[in-house]
Interface confidence: low
Amino acid sequence: SAPGEDEECGRVRDFVAKLANNTHQHVFDDLRGSVSLSWVGDSTGVILVLTTFHVPLVIMTFGQSKLYRSEDYGKNFKDITDLINNTFIRTEFGMAIGPENSGKVVLTAEVSGGSRGGRIFRSSDFAKNFVQTDLPFHPLTQMMYSPQNSDYLLALSTENGLWVSKNFGGKWEEIHKAVCLAKWGSDNTIFFTTYANGSCKADLGALELWRTSDLGKSFKTIGVKIYSFGLGGRFLFASVMADKDTTRRIHVSTDQGDTWSMAQLPSVGQEQFYSILAANDDMVFMHVDEPGDTGFGTIFTSDDRGIVYSKSLDRHLYTTTGGETDFTNVTSLRGVYITSVLSEDNSIQTMITFDQGGRWTHLRKPENSECDATAKNKNECSLHIHASYSISQKLNVPMAPLSEPNAVGIVIAHGSVGDAISVMVPDVYISDDGGYSWTKMLEGPHYYTILDSGGIIVAIEHSSRPINVIKFSTDEGQCWQTYTFTRDPIYFTGLASEPGARSMNISIWGFTESFLTSQWVSYTIDFKDILERNCEEKDYTIWLAHSTDPEDYEDGCILGYKEQFLRLRKSSVCQNGRDYVVTKQPSICLCSLEDFLCDFGYYRPENDSKCVEQPELKGHDLEFCLYGREEHLTTNGYRKIPGDKCQGGVNPVREVKDLKKKCTSNFLSPEKQNSKSN
């Protein structure tokens, strides 16, 4: 039988009446156009909705936008367009919402061609009031908030000036000209690249990397011959042109650019690229593109310094610079990532790692599914997940995989079961253990979202026809109830719930279309009465994450420790609540060689966990730059995997090798760096 239709599924009592009393419709007095929605703050219930409508005239495009505000999670909206003087807001800049619960919002207005600068509307009270401010420049990018201080903003102008405000956009100062890219670092530091000659494009590979730690009073040049730079976790990366040819290499700094080391990664040519797939304070996943237009490359994982890299996954699908990759961090379980590889026969297969890139495997075939036509053996196949690449290829996949940190273990994704991703219509699959095992959850493509930290999953069928039915599950997708939320079907455009999956409200967005007009409409459904009571201790059960063999004394050990979670029982219909905190009990594991990666100049032979010296490097100077200076590198051949917390057990002791190395990069060494003040 189809999921949710077997005898075991009990119905939630009186849910139709309960949901009907908690379904709120809002019809927007708008022609259709486009709509964008932003949540302001966390647990505030404040939503801003911007609708825009373009009327193409013969000579120009006339635009009209409206701004609406809700303070009850979308149940009711108020038209506040008058607060922004009925100005047309530029949707390409979106709504710039301040970090944390600052309550700050910046909207960028469209201005007439001849004006001296742009215009913004600023609010610091969760969009209750706005202040209009005329800018001394035309913005090229959305205003960027400093993560540490929401009063500090930066923006690039259309003339490549770097502008900074210290009073939440009230007053602006141009701190540097000829800027290509600017980013906030930690401690209100700004990193940016500058060009000297023609333009950003013309000087690519000859850019300079600058830093200011005092909002433009003084500057330090921290790199030259820069192609691009990026920030990830505590790492600052720069790709730097080589001296002799057109190749470039990654350099890394962990001290905001004061000192640099050359990353032990392959260099890339003009047509290739590097991409930081994921980074935290421990390590980074780096994709290095293969030469030629292959559409794939190699994933490397770093050590704790960001310098030494281990090959993690070959033939990793990543189409072009800024193109599509399926790389997904499964946020509901530590150490889990999913991505796609391009196999030799050009089929695409999904791979999963449970140990932060140490090993990748195929996804286990769901027990309630059969292998499709892509499978050579009808009894042996895997689950393959549709993500960004499938969406870009216009397959019938409305959503990327979904996981939430506070819905422990839950992963929802579209997929197909076979030897590779299929172009056939996918189904929706769910894992409740972070990707180890999967079950078919819904037939056919759906939109889905997680509410109440996993207590409720909501889904809507992806259809070209108008819809009026929503499905929900209170047992992690095993059983489903359907609720008709309106008599008049709507053309569905999206599901919206507060980020963080703590809310019990879901908003269904769409439009109605009649002979003469079409209007935006939203239905907000509050599930609080479905989950009538607060969860108690008896509603939770102990779950050991990463458990694959209860017989095993180290069952659950990943990166040196195991974690037991308190998880809601599937049979419990109750509220985790907005204040729900994931309860976990970590315990340390003893170290094994698997808790160490091989240091520079060492590698692991197949099916061995010992690190041995690379034969080709024996007796050679190593192309390994530490802080840009020639010095001796000593290593025992092993380094603890970043984030690994194991204690005791194996402590690999090796004869210390004296690896004398030379620096092949002409990247700025500390003594060549210069500073200047304004």
């Epitope: 095993d552 180290e554 069952d555 594991c589 003893l590």
Partner: antibody
Framework: QVQLVQSGAEVKKPGASVKVSCKAS????????MSWVRQAPGQGLEWMGI????????SYAQKFRGRVTMTRDTSTSTVYMELSSLRSEDTAVYYC??????????????????????WGQGTTVTVSS | EIVMTQSPATLSVSPGERATLSCRAS??????LAWYQQKPGQAPRLLIY???TRATGIPARFSGSGSGTEFTLTISSLQSEDFAVYYC?????????FGGGTKVEIK
């Protein structure tokens, strides 16, 4: 030097419990797992379970689950193995062994096993009515 | 659980001769295998770990080989002190399991 010293021989009646101790010395107690292995008269070796001195987590062979309890006292560097509901077929020599693997038993193929490198002298447990 | 099968059950060899003991696993244990020697009235002693690495203080005449499911312990030239029972043990999957043992006796 590294050694494991076990408690003395025991004679028990069927249905009773026995608790064998194993005191470690000469190395850092928390750095190594401890396994328990038994050997019935004239028979081979049988692994009973393992304890992680850090945290005290355990894993028992299915055959003994529900009857065996392994504990440790880090202050005295001692591990204990208690076997309850004794029957005559539990008559055996019980060994504690240092198991320095520090590996996940269900881990990938490239894990490396170091073997049980230090053994106690054995404790004879006789179950007889 | 993984079943370890040793053969032969008894091996009669003259001193100075070569002895080859076999151990087969019911499924792959990779190289997570150890060999032990036990003499009457004594606790077992670790000879080989990781399928092929000699433990500290073990003479060079003892060598281990194999990976996956088939393993061999070789004693190149038997000495009088080598007559004992030899056990293999896997640590690939819990529970750890031992083979039934091979008794090496004087021919």
């Amino acid at each position: 030097q590294v050694q494991l010293v076990q408690s003395g021989a025991e004679v028990k009646k069927p249905g009773a419990s026995v608790k064998v101790s194993c005191k470690a010395s000469g190395y850092t107690f928390t750095k190594y797992y401890m396994s328990w292995v038994r050997q019935a008269p004239g028979q081979g070796l049988e692994w009973m379970g393992i304890i992680n001195p850090i945290g005290g987590s355990t894993s028992y062979a299915q055959k003994f689950r529900g009857r065996v309890t392994m504990t440790r006292d880090t202050s005295t560097s001692t591990v204990y193995m208690e076997l309850s509901s004794l029957r005559s077929e539990d008559t055996a020599v019980y060994y504690c062994t240092r198991d320095p693997s520090g590996i996940a038993a269900a881990g990938p193929a490239s894990r490396y096993y170091y073997g049980m490198d230090v053994w106690g002298q054995g404790t004879t447990v006789t179950v007889s009515s | 659980e993984i079943v370890m099968t040793q053969s032969p059950a008894t091996l009669s060899v003259s001193p100075g001769e070569r002895a080859t003991l076999s151990c087969r696993a019911s499924q792959s244990v990779s190289s997570n295998l150890a060999w032990y020697q036990q003499k009457p009235g004594q606790a077992p002693r670790l000879l080989i770990y990781g399928a092929s690495t000699r433990a500290t203080g073990i003479p060079a005449r003892f060598s281990g080989s194999g990976s996956g499911t088939e393993f061999t312990l070789t004693i190149s030239s038997l000495q009088s002190e080598d007559f004992a029972v030899y056990y293999c043990q896997q640590a690939r999957l819990g529970p750890w399991t031992f083979g039934g043992g091979t008794k090496v006796e004087i021919k």
